[in-house]
Every structure is written in C-alpha cells, then in structure tokens.
Amino acid sequence: DSSKWVFEHPETLYAWEGACVWIPCTYRALDGDLESFILFHNPEYNKNTSKFDGTRLYESTKDGKVPSEQKRVQFLGDKNKNCTLSIHPVHLNDSGQLGLRMESKTEKWMERIHLNVSERPFPPHIQLPPEIQESQEVTLTCLLNFSCYGYPIQLQWLLEGVPMRQAAVTSTSLTIKSVFTRSELKFSPQWSHHGKIVTCQLQDADGKFLSNDTVQLNVKHTPKLEIKVTPSDAIVREGDSVTMTCEVSSSNPEYTTVSWLKDGTSLKKQNTFTLNLREVTKDQSGKYCCQVSNDVGPGRSEEVFLQVQYAPEPSTVQILHSPAVEGSQVEFLCMSLANPLPTNYTWYHNGKEMQGRTEEKVHIPKILPWHAGTYSCVAENILGTGQRGPGAELDVQYPPKKVTTVIQNPMPIREGDTVTLSCNYNSSNPSVTRYEWKPHGAWEEPSLGVLKIQNVGWDNTTIACAACNSWCSWASPVALNVQYAPRDVRVRKIKPLSEIHSGNSVSLQCDFSSSHPKEVQFFWEKNGRLLGKESQLNFDSISPEDAGSYSCWVNNSIGQTASKAWTLEVLYAPRRLRVSMSPGDQVMEGKSATLTCESDANPPVSHYTWFDWNNQSLPYHSQKLRLEPVKVQHSGAYWCQGTNSVGKGRSPLSTLTVYYSPETIGRR
C-alpha cells in the first residue's frame, strides 16, 4: 500500500561542478524499519524484470556494508525517519533524477528527487523592493538556491564595484522545505545613488569570485536644485537688479512644476527657472529659494539671502520709560531701519545736539528735571545719513520743589488774631493736587494751599505745610511768633519755707509761666492798695497786721494778668488778753457771773488757764469761767492765760466785786 510511505524533501536541488549537494530528507514507513536502500541516478522501471534499471550511486544491504567506491555519495539517514543524502563532490553528469529505492519487510517505494548541476557556479539573484525612495530604508536581498555543509560560500555586496559599508545579514537554509543561502542588506539610499550599480558577488571560502548578479538602482527622489544669483554675494543697493537662476541637477521622475519662495512664502507668477528682480527695494530683502516638484514631492534649493542695502530711514526714539521719576535711570534707543546697520548716531535734546553721544543707546543713570524734553536722533551708515524723526517726549516727574509756608498777616501776631497762611512752591510735575499741614487742627482751608486759623492760640508756635502731587514735599516749619499777655501768674512764698511767724523775714515771688514779649512789669496789691513794682515783695519783720489777701499783676505790651488772691497768714502767740465780766464787774451774790478770757491769737488759743488774786490757778480751762451762784467770797482780782502753738499770753487783773443781796443784808 503506497499510502504508507510519506517523504519530505526539496523538489529540486541545485549545485555546480566540483561543489557538493546536501539533500535534507525525511520519510515514514509505517509497516516497519527500512531493510534496503539504493540510490539510483535516472532510474527506469523495467516491466520485464519488475525492477529498476539505472546507475546505482549508493547501495546499502541488510548487513549494512557499503562498497568503498560509494564514498562520494553518503546516506546520512536511518531505518525509520531520516533519508538525508550527501554527494561530495558533485559532478555535471550527476544532473538528472535521483531515485531513492526504499524496501521494508513487506513494502517497496521509489522516491524521485531532481538534481540540477551546472558547469559553472550559477549567479545569485538580487531582489529589490518595487519602489525605492531616497532616505527610506530598504532591504536588498541576494538569494542563491544553494547550500551545502561541505562547501562554504559567501555573498558580498558592492556599490559601483566598491564593497558596501553597511553590515549584511547572511542566513542559510538546509531543510526539507528549502535549500538556499541568503544575504540581506539594510540600506538608506540617497538621491545620488540613483542609476548606480549594485552587485551581489558569490565567493568561495577564500573570497575567490564565483559568480554575481547586478542591478541598477532606480532611486525616486525630489528634484535636486542649485541656485545661482547675480551678483554672487547677493548684496545690492536699492534700485539694482538681481537675477536668480534655478538649476535642476537631478530629478526622478522628471520635474513637473517650478516656483520661487521668499522667506518661506511662494512668490506669485514666478514659475520659470529664472527670477528677475528689477530695481529692487529694501522690502525685497530676504531669503530666496526655488522649489521644483515631481511625483515624489517638492525639492528646494539652498536659501540665498538677498541683502538690499539702503541709507537709514527717518529714525524714531524709544524711551524706557517715560514718564520717568527724578533720580531714576532712563535709556533712549534710536531706531532706524537701515542696511547695513547704522555705525554712527547723532542725538538731539530739544533740538540741540548732545555732545559725545554717538551710540544707538543713550543711558542717563540719574534723571533730573532739566532732562525733560524732546529727544531725537539721526542714524548714519555707509550709504548715507538718515533724517531726524519726530522725536519722543521725556516727562520727568518729581515732588514739588522749594515748598515754603508764608504768613499773610501783618506782624506781630497776637493771641486771638485770625492768621492766614499760604503754601507756596517753585515747580511741580505732575501738578500739585493737595496740601497737608502740621500740626493738625480744626482749621479751615478757604482755598487750595491756604490755611486760616481763627482765634490763634498763644501756644501755636510753628506751622509747616506740604505740597503734594504723587509725592509730598514739606516746607521748613514757620514760627508764628504769637504775642500774648503773661500767663499763669501766681503768688509764691519764697521764705520762710515753713509757716510764717510774727517777726519772720518774709519774701513773696510773683511768678508767671510765659510771656511774649518777654519784657514785663510787676505790681503788688493788698486790698486794692499798691504795695510794690518788683517781682518780689519782702517783709523784714512780719507782723500780724501784714496778714491779708495779696495779689500780683504782671503786664507786657500785649496786656496784664493778675494772680489769684493769695492769703498771707501770720502766726503769733496770744496777745491783747483781757478778762471781760458779764453781766458786769459788780454782781450780787447768788446771781450768775461769767468771766470771758478774750484774746488775739493765730492760731486761736487752744488752752486757757484761770488765775485768782493769789495767782492760784483755778480748775477751769475753757475760755469762759462761769460762777453760779456767785458768792461774796468770789470777789477779787482775776486774770487768764491763753496758750496756742506759738506761745502763751496773760491778761491783766480784772476785779470782780460780789456784793451781798438784800436778803443777806436783811439777815444781818
């Protein structure tokens, strides 16, 4: 049953004279192991003998012996799976059909394999992708339908006969499916490779040439361009003519359109290979290139930088920054379109040339008010001098200058007057918008910068004003110099330091806290009577009669001021003591008699003592001695003694006469 035999191997194998052939082969005989194997060259079946005729290249017997002449052909298989064969060397006349006659215990099979042996090494085959584009990586494949373990070969890539630098990857296949040697080369072709010859060369192990295959590269690429300009440096003056020519050095496929670009933007109606710019203007300065397209895409030339040179245009001035604050720094920039760039500048301030300023920038490190004004400049290059533009205004802002506080009143100012002050300044930028005054008060400002003080106080000493714009500038304070009558007049005892005792030396001082003007006069008075005109009132030996209410007056040219009344108190021992009797010095017995000790004392008598005619002190200590009922024996002379903190005083004797009542007389 033939279906029991299954073979796998390449259908045809290729080799050349002197090389070798390796035939990978597998089989399956389901009924048992292989018992006999014969390799025929071009076998033919003989119906008469029911056997195959042909050259026997290899024969194995049951005992496994192989004749020595069969060493060229080797069966590398086994009895149940592998039927691999090797012929080394292989000869031209080995071409044809190889027949593998397989016999097992019960079955037979003839498997045919084609062998193609050429006289010389056959060339490999280069495979290219359907389209090659510049800069796109492609894989070049060189395929040779040959591989044999006993005959090493190599494939080398050449470009225009020169080995290619890129590393190729070589692979071999010796399988039942295919036998080949393949070299793959990854390659990024450039447009310059278009039309170049690529060769895959087959070499033996020693590098000896065996055969090759060549292809011509067809590299699709955008047009490659060269731009030429007259004049060649592309530097011209306004009014000159410029010609640019676009040359296509290579294009695959052929180009279809041409255009010109300036600064990346297409120029309208410029679709030829020559760009003529007649009487150029400065606006035509820029980067020019030509663009030519084909089916691959657009190609661009290198850029040509056309410089149209011209004298500076009227200049403008840029100020960093205006308005400027006094003391800050300011930079002026002269801006003028020119080609080539200006090399020299002339600066003007309010129409007058600024000496020594020849640069594009002017830097003023510390701005002052006089720097304000119009700044203009003139730029100059090799082609000429530009015109002076309109200029720019520098506004210098500063606080109000020379601020003064001015008193409008006639002098001197008196306490209680109405005073008007004005706040003046020399200059200000921006304008003054408000004023401030020190010290603050409930004063009215009838108009901007004017202050009215009603009923000016004696103590309004100085006033300062500030004029304010964005900043406040304070004036030096102005003294009002308000004149007023003496203030805080009072009487002050200078001596003695303690209480005044009769006989002391006493000094009183007329004090005042302030006076303007300072020149003053003093007046002392007691009970409306003028006592003196000095600041002090002196008593060499004070007497109780000097006690009383004293006032002093101080006056200046503005007015006079009196002190409060000051009471002068003189302390003295009891004096002028006398004993008065009530109802009289003659009293009838049985009646009531009251003796009173009268005295003059400061402080008042604090303790009384009564004495009789014998100078015997009586047990009575009050001011009044009451005898009730009075007796005849009470008749006699009495005196009293008064005591205070200063001392003692005694009265003269006063006689009390007590006479008998009619009853007593009647009884007698």
Epitope: P231, S232, V236, S241, E279, I382
Partner: antibody, heavy 123, light 102 residues
C-alpha cells in the same frame, strides 16, 4: 559685440575742468551700471566713478570725490565724466567700464572695457 | 587689496594668483601693456566672460580670491589686477601681479 569708445581727453590746464564722454553700443545700455577707471603712467588701475543703471546712486573714488560728476543719457547710450579743479595727479589714461549687472559693485563686476582716452594735466 | 607682485610658470603648468583684503566679490583683469585696455578674465568671483578660455577660473574662500590658470600658455603673460569694493561700494584694485611664462 560690446563696444565702448571714450573721447574728450587731451592736454588740460591745472585748475581747469574736463569732460569725458563714453559712447556705448552692442548691448542694452540702460540695463547696466557704467563707470570710469584710470591708470596713471607706470601705475596700476584706479577706480574713478561708477553709476547704477537707473542713476539712483553714484560712487566716487577718494581722489576725485567732490570734484567729479558722473552722469548718463540712456537715450543716447552715453556716459559722461566731468572732472573739475584738475591737478597734475589726474594725468593718465581714462577707461570707460561696463558692469556685468545693473548695479555698481565697485571694481568686482566689470565685464567690458573701452580702449581709453589719455588726459595730460600740465601748465 | 594684497596680491603678489610677480609669479612665473612654465607653459602647461597651473598658476594660482591670490588676492585678499575684501569681504566682497572680486574680479580679475588682464593688461598686456601699460595704458592698453584691460581685459576681464573673471568677474563676480567665478564668472568668466564667454570669450575667455576655460583655463581661467576664479574661486573665493573667506576674504581671499584666487585666479587659477590651468595649463598656462605663453599668450597669458601679462599683469593681472584684482578688483573689489569697500563697504561703501567704492572700487578698489590690487597693485597688480606680473605673470611671466618661462
């Protein structure tokens, strides 16, 4: 063929003035810059003056600046050089020169020369 | 502009004459006799008038321009002036290089 014919040379008096004329033919005169180059006896070439095709600017050598005026008549295809206040050092051969372009690029783009006219300044 | 005062060469040799000193374009002018009309051999760095032989070529590198005569011939014997311009477009010439063909 481009032809440039100079005239107006000869013996000149110091302090006086001269007027040289260049008649051009064989090219579109109005499209090209034109100028004058001179050569003192035994010396090298010296740039005198050049004028752009549209007469939009003039360039003068340092030795003649302020004394020379270059002008052109595109209708007559003529170039003129007026040189005043003549000095002995103005003696030499004056060549008419054509620029390869419409502009004047000094002495770098001359592509045609006249045969020259000799000027002698002497008292 | 700076150029050598003289150079010499045998017929068939290559001669190079340098000129330096300008950042702008250059021209080369041949004068066979003093006072005779100069002939432009190169203008604008590399351009050769149509009637000038191809053995004359010009090249520029930086501020130096070179006139090259490849295969010099006896009739090339002359004074060669280089020309350029300053930044203000005023023309300037070199002092001239005398080429002697031996």
């Amino acid at each position: 063929a481009v032809t440039l014919d100079e005239s107006g040379g000869g013996l000149q008096t110091p302090g006086g003035g001269l007027s040289l004329v260049c008649k051009a033919s064989g090219f579109s005169f109005s499209d090209y810059g034109m100028g004058w180059v001179r050569q003192a006896p035994g010396k090298g070439l010296e740039f005198v003056a050049f004028l752009g095709s549209s007469s939009s600017y003039t360039d003068y050598g340092a030795a003649v600046k302020g004394r020379a005026t270059i002008s052109r008549d595109n209708g007559q295809s003529t170039l003129r050089l007026q040189l005043n206040n003549l000095r002995a050092e103005d003696t030499g051969t004056y060549f008419c020169a054509k620029s390869a372009y419409g502009g004047s690029y000094g002495s770098s783009s001359i592509d045609a020369w006249g045969h020259g006219t000799e000027v002698i300044v002497s008292s | 502009l700076t150029q050598p005062s003289s150079v010499s060469a045998n017929p068939g040799e290559t001669v190079k004459i340098t000129c330096s000193g300008s950042n702008n374009t250059y021209g080369w002018y041949q004068q066979k006799a003093p006072g005779s009309a100069p002939v432009t051999v190169i203008y604008d760095n590399t351009n050769r008038p149509s009637d000038i032989p191809s053995r004359f070529s010009g090249s520029k590198s930086g501020s130096t321009n070179t006139l090259t005569i490849t295969g010099v011939q006896a009739e090339d014997e002359a004074v060669y002036f280089c020309g350029s311009r300053d930044s203000t477009y005023v023309g300037i010439f070199g002092a001239g290089t005398t080429l002697t063909v031996l």
